[in-house]
């Protein structure tokens, strides 16, 4: 991954914080939030982008070359944006305009554009589709996707908070 210009860390921090809140509002669980079940081999099996140790999102990795980590976050944002665009969220029960889900979708797009302003070719991604006999699964899939997104955004927000605190270019005073 080539080293390129750094993002606006402070703006990314603000947007990612807002996204965390929106994801929570879109699906606030009953009771306490527990951690996702994850297994090491699930990454390759399901092609679900997760921020892992080797992605360079730790403080040292960000300092050395933040592009590795940012690329991972970009992939995750694109993945979840595609899911929010899929039949799972577009079908019944319909989502209301300006609902937390719609706001979440808009903000995901906003952060993606902030990280990736130029037009990159989209990776082809297999979207889950439900047969007529599987329509009952839609609410469960929405819940699982939003729970997974909440976990992803929580880590991304920590990355941007660290970047904003330590990697932001200091302002040069003018004479």
């Amino acid at each position: 991954v080539p080293r390129s210009s750094s993002p606006d860390w402070a703006q990314c921090q603000q947007l990612s914080r807002n996204l965390c809140m929106l994801a929570w509002n879109a699906h606030a669980p009953a009771g306490h939030m527990n951690l996702l079940r994850e297994e090491e081999d699930e990454e390759t099996k399901n092609n679900v982008p997760r921020i892992q140790c080797e992605d360079g999102c730790d403080p040292q990795g960000l300092k050395d070359n933040s592009q590795f980590c940012l690329q991972r976050i970009r992939q995750g944002l694109a993945f979840y944006k595609h899911l929010l665009d899929s039949d799972i969220f577009k079908g019944e029960p319909a989502l209301l305009p300006d609902s937390p889900m719609e706001q979440l979708h808009t903000s995901l797009l906003g952060l993606s554009q902030l990280l990736q302003p130029e037009d990159h070719p989209r990776e082809t991604q297999q979207m889950p589709s439900l047969s007529s006999s599987q329509q009952w699964q839609r609410p469960l899939l929405r819940s699982k996707i939003l729970r997974s997104l909440q976990a992803f955004l929580a880590i991304a927000a920590r990355v941007f908070a660290h970047g904003a605190a330590t990697l932001t270019e200091p302002l040069v005073p003018t004479a």
């Epitope: 669980p29 009953a30 527990n34 819940s143 699982k144």
Partner: nanobody, 122 residues
Framework: EVQLVESGGGLVQAGGSLRLSCAAS????????MGWFRQAPGKERDFVAA????????TYADSVKGRFTISRDNAKNTVYLQMNSLKPEDTAVYYC???????????????WGQGTQVTVSS
């Protein structure tokens, strides 16, 4: 892997009620979406109701909407199916199942209980 044991089935008259329970062990119960399915004699196993990991999202088959209610108690590792206004056509073996998929983009009820018989007489 999670083990599931159903209870609460029995013989009831049409219009009556039953409450099924499904006790889970051997897994992180609060991580799993849970579902109830049923199989009538000579028929395929059909979806009845399901609930997400936290209990905030539920979904039902059209045939039981308004009559059945699924709920869960994560502290007790148990999922329930409250069945009211029972009809003879609700007669079946009722199975509890856990979504064993770690992926957010699939549902896989891969772990099943042994079932409990519900018979509704007219």
């Amino acid at each position: 892997e999670v083990q599931l044991v159903e209870s609460g089935g029995g013989l009831v008259q049409a219009g009556g009620s039953l409450r099924l329970s499904c006790a889970a062990s051997g897994g992180t119960f609060s991580s799993y979406a849970m579902g109830w399915f049923r199989q009538a004699p000579g028929k395929e196993r059909d979806f009845v109701a399901a609930i997400d990991w936290s209990g905030s999202t539920t979904t039902y088959a059209d045939s039981v909407k308004g009559r059945f209610t699924i709920s869960r108690d994560n502290a007790k590792n148990t999922v329930y199916l409250q069945m009211n206004s029972l009809k003879p056509e609700d007669t079946a073996v009722y199975y509890c199942a856990a979504d064993m998929s770690h992926s957010p983009i699939e549902i896989d009820f891969g772990s099943w209980g042994q079932g409990t018989q519900v018979t509704v007489s007219s």
